[in-house]
Interface confidence: medium
Amino acid sequence: MMTGTIETTGNISAEKGGSIILQCHLSSTTAQVTQVNWEQQDQLLAICNADLGWHISPSFKDRVAPGPGLGLTLQSLTVNDTGEYFCIYHTYPDGTYTGRIFLEVLESSVAEHGARFQIP
């Protein structure tokens, strides 16, 4: 029986050119997390495997950074980054849990003041 729940960053908006952190947390289960996939619609952005560590999809390598934790940082945002993002927790023995985040990237005349940051 799947008892876990996923809490996420929620619905968020950002401005073009900035950075954003996507974070999810799986709670209320003792299941072992074997892998977390981050997907945007049908595209795989990144995988964090419990044994093998992080893999960032080649097409996103320049703009996606792993972390914090099992989260993901998107950089140099464009309006095309608007959409649904999913954190997919593969667990044993429960199976798969999915969290959803909706990101809206806005055009801005003041984007040069935007949030650019790094994950140490």
């Epitope: 809490e7 996420t8 960053t9 929620g10 619905n11 968020i12 908006s13 950002a14 401005e15 900035g18 950075s19 954003i20 952190i21 996507l22 974070q23 947390h25 709670s27 990101l103 801005s108 003041v110 984007a111 003041h113 935007g114 949030a115 940051f117």
Partner: nanobody, 115 residues
Framework: EVQLVESGGGLVQPGGSLRLSCAAS????????MGWFRQAPGKEREWVAS???????WYADSVKGRFTISADNSKNTAYLQMNSLKPEDTAVYYC?????????WGQGTLVTVSS
């Protein structure tokens, strides 16, 4: 208008403590996520810690075990308790909501760790 106002910074000796506060206003719903960032002179702004509404927290390796982030959802306020401060923690500290995007950033609060 959305506003995030940081306070609580100051001058403290190495090994000392400070508690930063971030008062958030101007939006209808309590943010799902709040975080703290910092920017040292001549360096890029970096993420320090974040907390989900349900209370789950993350920390940068450099502050793990020394800093504690928390949020009071009823007051739309986030806190950063900083213990065992080191000179390398000297920076302007900023808070952010909803994944770390906030434009414009607030004024921040300056933390100086020096003897």
């Amino acid at each position: 208008e959305v506003q995030l106002v940081e306070s609580g910074g100051g001058l403290v000796q190495p090994g000392g403590s400070l508690r930063l506060s971030c008062a958030a206003s101007g939006f209808t719903f309590s943010p799902s996520w709040m975080g703290w960032f910092r920017q040292a002179p001549g360096k890029e702004r970096e993420w320090v810690a974040s907390v989900l509404r349900g209370g789950y927290t993350w920390y940068a390796d450099s502050v793990k075990g020394r800093f504690t982030i928390s949020a009071d959802n009823s007051k739309n306020t986030a806190y950063l308790q900083m213990n065992s401060l080191k000179p390398e923690d000297t920076a302007v500290y900023y808070c952010a909501k909803d994944g770390g995007w906030f434009d414009p950033w607030g004024q921040g609060t300056l933390v100086t760790v020096s003897s």
